[in-house]
């Protein structure tokens, strides 16, 4: 993630800024969506609770060849403390429910906006 420290004292992005940037990216995706996002690919739905950043990444990482969500995947990896690879699943997945990537992004965006409003950045 980008470094927003002063020239003399570079440091990591504050969590609020990182969350803001992730929200901005998801907004860009929803705004710029012409054709079905990622050709209508389906991903596992997730529970939007603690640990949901890793769960979201685990779902989206299984979508390949979709440039529209590559930046989101990279940003989510900055929120997830462990390495995530395709085929990995956590208990946060609603394993019997698949939804389109576009709906997944929409649900995630709404939840992140509420977290931002509540000051929950980590």
């Amino acid at each position: 993630l980008t470094c927003l420290g002063g020239f003399a004292s570079p440091g990591p992005v504050p969590p609020s800024t990182a969350l803001r940037e992730l929200i901005e990216e998801l907004v860009n995706i929803t705004q710029n969506q012409k054709a079905p996002l990622c050709n209508g690919s389906m991903v596992w739905s997730i529970n939007l609770t603690a640990g949901m950043y890793c769960a979201a990444l685990e779902s989206l990482i299984n979508v390949s060849g979709c440039s529209a969500i590559e930046k989101t995947q990279r940003m989510l990896s900055g929120f997830c403390p462990h390495k995530v690879s395709a085929g990995q699943f956590s208990s946060l997945h609603v394993r019997d429910t698949k939804i389109e990537v576009a709906q997944f992004v929409k649900d995630l965006l709404l939840h992140l906006k509420k977290l931002f409003r509540e000051g929950q950045f980590n």
Epitope: R20, V27, T30, L48, L110, K113, K114, R117, G119, F121
Partner: antibody, heavy 125, light 112 residues
Framework: QVQLVQSGAEVKKPGSSVKVSCKAS????????MHWVRQAPGQGLEWMGT????????KYVPKFQGRVTITADESTSTAYMELSSLRSEDTAVYYC??????????????????WGQGTLVTVSS | DIVMTQSPLSLPVTPGEPASISCRSS???????????LEWYLQKPGQSPRLLIY???DRFSGVPDRFSGSGSGTDFTLKISRVEADDVGIYYC?????????FGQGTKLEIK
């Protein structure tokens, strides 16, 4: 169009409870916070609490904690405010209001942009 | 709890003249996310309140540009550049930055 329609006026005895409903239309309540605000006769506005209908998380003003319960039913797009152990000082108009979150701005206004018409609750022996 | 103090409590204004309402918070109301959730609402006689201004200075859709908000930290102002007869009512400031969220006591604007 967006509407919040509240239940009708109530007359209650001291010590009893009241449950006011707020039926939403024209939007999904899971995309919002739903708030409750009250106004005693001739007095100002008092925020009581809020709910995130997507997960049921609530925030209450400490003075109402334990007496107020805010709930929401996504299936009927309705928010509820229940106030128990009523006393005469609870006589007021109770309003519901929403704060909406949309897909098209990174930072929504979050403020209470639509309000119900108000429900008068009279507490009298 | 954060106390929001408005002044004046009563504001008689001649139509066409400007009006200004002050709102002071008992402590800084910058939210942890960097925003300041300071809002202004107008309640006309017999009606529900309606949103005028959010985040200090952003006008809500449909609100005339005669209304403007300013301020920072603990001091905020609502200005009406030219008051019209339709502007009568009670104006409330509100902070939504720190729970419990709180309203000011209201300023009653009346036409002279």
């Amino acid at each position: 169009q967006v509407q919040l329609v509240q239940s009708g006026a109530e007359v209650k005895k001291p010590g009893s409870s009241v449950k006011v409903s707020c039926k939403a239309s024209g939007f999904y309540i899971k995309d919002t916070y739903m708030h409750w605000v009250r106004q005693a006769p001739g007095q100002g506005l008092e925020w009581m609490g809020t709910i995130d209908p997507a997960n049921g998380n609530t925030k209450y003003v400490p003075k109402f904690q334990g007496r107020v319960t805010i709930t929401a039913d996504e299936s009927t797009s309705t928010a509820y405010m229940e106030l128990s152990s009523l006393r005469s000082e609870d006589t007021a108009v109770y309003y519901c209001a929403r704060s909406i979150y949309d897909d098209y701005h990174w930072d929504d206004y979050y403020a209470m942009d639509y309000w119900g018409q108000g429900t008068l609750v009279t507490v009298s022996s | 709890d954060i106390v929001m103090t408005q002044s004046p409590l009563s504001l008689p204004v001649t139509p066409g003249e400007p009006a200004s309402i002050s709102c002071r918070s008992s402590q800084n109301i910058v939210h942890i996310n960097g925003n300041t959730y300071l809002e202004w609402y107008l309640q006309k006689p017999g009606q529900s309140p309606r949103l005028l201004i959010y985040k200090i200075s952003d006008r809500f859709s449909g609100v005339p540009d005669r209304f403007s908000g300013s301020g920072s930290g603990t001091d905020f102002t609502l200005k009406i550049s030219r008051v019209e007869a339709d502007d009568v009512g009670i104006y409330y400031c509100f902070q939504g930055s720190h729970v419990p969220w709180t309203f000011g006591q209201g300023t009653k604007l009346e036409i002279k």
